[in-house]
């Protein structure tokens, strides 16, 4: 038999089909010019010492073949003796090691049989009614077509898939969507109609997310609060990688994730803007405010399942750093500015109250005033802290108000609000003897020691009314009892408390008169 | 030892349909063209229908064209023949047949074939 030609013999080889998984597969005949034909194949397993023939069946009844050596790829004309307009029916064998391997069988009428090319551009995948949908425009001269998909995840092997007849400019394919798990597609087309046309090859993979973006397992910390009024935002544990089949690892366009962080300001409620969304790489500073934390996952089919952490407010107090005075006009605040031209957000909630019920006021940008301190005022009327309870002021500075991980904290402290020097004095004073020349005071703690830092000291006062002499004597704010000693028997005293704070001097208390019994001697 | 067992065959009304086996077993059935021949009394056992390995091309002789069709499944090393509209000349003993598939797949003569069955008897009654 000559090479060029189909050799209608018996192959030079005994029959011994191996049954293996292994061999040719794959086999794609088609016209390439008016006269001349190719069949291509592939070959699984090892190569060396393997001879490749080309078989064909013509429906007369006669069989022939090809030697191609240990090429996967036979060119052969019109006049090789392979009947191009009637149906043929080819296959591979194989012989290697003794015996002989065989491809499936393709069943076509050559002359028919065009190169069908897969999807060859852009894939366009989208979701539709909880099913995949995949989109790409139809290679060039070849509208009319029947199209398959295979696909696979990470655990299980290929499935075939059936996309049905195309016939239009643009080509489309309803797939699964898998809910939690990636998947891998691949495409193929053949001529639509033509019975028994060759198998296009498999397009490059189209890596598919699942419809569920893995939910987000991170954990955070949060730094110390710095000089600055700022504290960083860390990440203690990164998101798990999403795993991904086979011909989808390294680089996997369509299946990444993308986390980002939802911010949430709770604190100054006043302010512009309380949400901010960042990528989840570059972490923020924030405040000392309180905050809500999410981290929100996405694929390219939209959001996933949120992850939510609540960071509570920084509550470390500056005692001094708050100067508060109360005029007949109303109250002024003074504090250390920050620099020019800064928004000063005052939030202000009675204590031991839920942290929903905070106010606050924000302040139009100012510049710090000749003794570099920044300021808010408001009037009586206004009602602002105008009970007299324990507020918790906290102060937020910003040059840029609308971006919310540019806010920092200036100040907490405490305040007592409405007519402190008068709500803070102290009650039920009681003197008892102690000795023949002193007494024991003692008083019900002032509502000022309620807050914390509020109260500076007691002073408590005596007068003997005699002498009209008065004494007054500091007691620290944790203290609500004085012994006074040096008095003299037979004399009538007044004694007072009052209660001071570092900028306010409190009211007096009701004087309680008392008098040291003389002792009368046997 | 190869067998090809034959099944299916019985008595028939004309114009009714049988499916006859064929269970091959003792080889390896992808690498053989099966068919069918049948032989009525007193004449020459004919070709039938015949079918390559993988099943992608098939020849009828003409007198059961559009009446006969021949599958295989090679899964199951089984090869069929459905009988429509039978008519009275189709009795007779339908045996199948296996050869390899060399520089043939089909032979309209016996001499060609490696294997053969026992034989199942069709009657088809007018």
């Known amino acids: 038999c000559r090479t060029s030609e189909c050799c209608f013999q018996d192959p030079p080889y005994p029959d011994a089909d191996s049954g293996s998984a292994s061999g040719p597969r794959d086999l794609r005949c088609y016209r390439i010019s008016s006269d001349r034909y190719e069949c291509s194949w592939q070959y699984e397993g090892p190569t060396a010492g393997v001879s490749h023939f080309l078989r064909c069946c013509l429906s007369s009844g006669r069989c022939c073949y090809f030697a191609a050596g240990s090429a996967t790829r036979l060119q052969f004309s019109d006049q090789a003796g392979v009947s191009v307009l009637y149906t043929v029916t080819l296959w591979v064998e194989s012989w290697a090691r003794n015996q002989t391997e065989k491809s499936p069988e393709v069943t076509l009428q050559l002359y028919n049989s065009v190169k069908y090319e897969p999807p060859l551009g852009d894939i366009k995948v989208s979701k539709l009614a909880g099913q995949l949908r995949m989109e790409w425009e139809t290679p060039d001269n070849q509208v009319g077509a029947e199209v398959q998909f295979r696909h696979r995840t990470p655990s299980s092997p290929w499935k075939l898939g059936d996309c049905g007849p195309q016939d239009d400019d643009t080509e489309s394919c309803l797939c699964p969507l898998e809910m939690n798990v990636a998947q891998e597609f691949q495409l193929r087309r053949r001529q639509l109609g033509s019975q028994g046309s060759s198998w296009s090859k498999w397009s490059s993979p189209v890596c598919v997310p699942p419809e569920n973006p893995p939910q987000p397992q991170v954990r955070f910390s949060v730094e110390q609060l710095g000089q600055d009024g700022r504290r960083r935002l860390t990440l203690k544990e990164q998101p798990t990688q999403l795993e991904l089949p086979e011909g989808c690892q390294g680089l996997a366009p369509g299946t990444e994730v993308t986390y980002r962080l939802q911010l949430h300001m709770l604190s100054c409620p006043c302010k512009a803007k309380a949400t901010r969304t960042l990528h989840l790489g570059k972490m923020p500073y924030l405040s000392g405010a309180a905050y809500n934390v999410a981290v929100i996952s996405s694929n390219q089919f939209g959001p996933g399942l949120n992850q939510t952490w609540h960071i509570p407010a920084d509550t470390h107090t500056e005692p001094v750093a708050l100067n508060i005075s109360v005029g007949t006009n109303g109250t002024t605040m003074y504090w250390p500015a920050r620099a020019q031209s800064m928004t000063y957000c005052i939030e202000w909630q009675p204590v031991g109250q839920d942290g929903g019920l905070a106010t606050c006021s924000l302040t139009a940008p100012q510049d710090p005033d000749p003794a570099g301190m920044a300021t808010y005022s408001w009037s009586r009327e206004s009602g602002a802290m105008g009970q007299e309870k324990c507020y918790y002021i906290t102060i937020f500075a910003s040059a840029h108000p609308e971006k919310l991980t540019l806010w920092s904290t200036v100040l907490s402290t405490y305040h007592f609000g409405g007519n402190a020097s008068a709500a803070g004095t102290p009650h039920h004073v009681s003197v008892k003897n102690h000795s023949l020349d002193s007494v024991s005071v003692d008083w019900a703690p002032s509502l000022l020691s309620t807050c914390p830092g509020v109260l500076k000291e007691y002073v408590v006062r005596c007068r003997d009314e005699d002498s009209k002499q008065v004494s007054e004597h500091p007691v620290q704010p944790t203290e609500t009892q004085v012994t006074l000693s040096g008095l003299r028997a037979g004399v009538a005293y007044t004694v007072q408390v009052r209660a001071d704070t570092a900028w306010l001097r409190g009211v007096w208390s009701q004087p309680q008169r008392f008098s040291i019994e003389v002792q009368v001697s046997d | 030892e190869v067998q090809l067992v034959e099944s299916g065959g019985g008595l028939v009304q004309a114009g009714g349909s049988l499916r006859l086996s064929c269970a091959a077993s003792?080889?390896?059935?992808?690498?053989?063209?099966m068919a069918w021949f049948r032989q009525a009394p007193g004449k020459e056992r004919e070709f039938v229908a015949g079918?390559?390995?993988?099943?992608?091309?098939?020849h009828y002789v003409d007198s059961v064209k559009g009446r006969f069709t021949i599958s295989r499944d090679n899964g199951k090393n089984t090869v069929y023949l459905q009988m429509n509209s039978l008519k009275s000349e189709d009795t007779a003993v339908y045996y199948c047949a296996g050869k390899t598939q060399g520089s043939t797949w089909y032979h309209l003569t016996p001499d060609g074939y490696d294997y053969w069955g026992q034989g199942t008897q069709v009657t088809v009654s007018s």
């Open positions: 079918i390559t390995w993988g099943g992608g091309l098939t």
């Open positions: 003792g080889l390896t059935f992808r690498n053989y063209a």
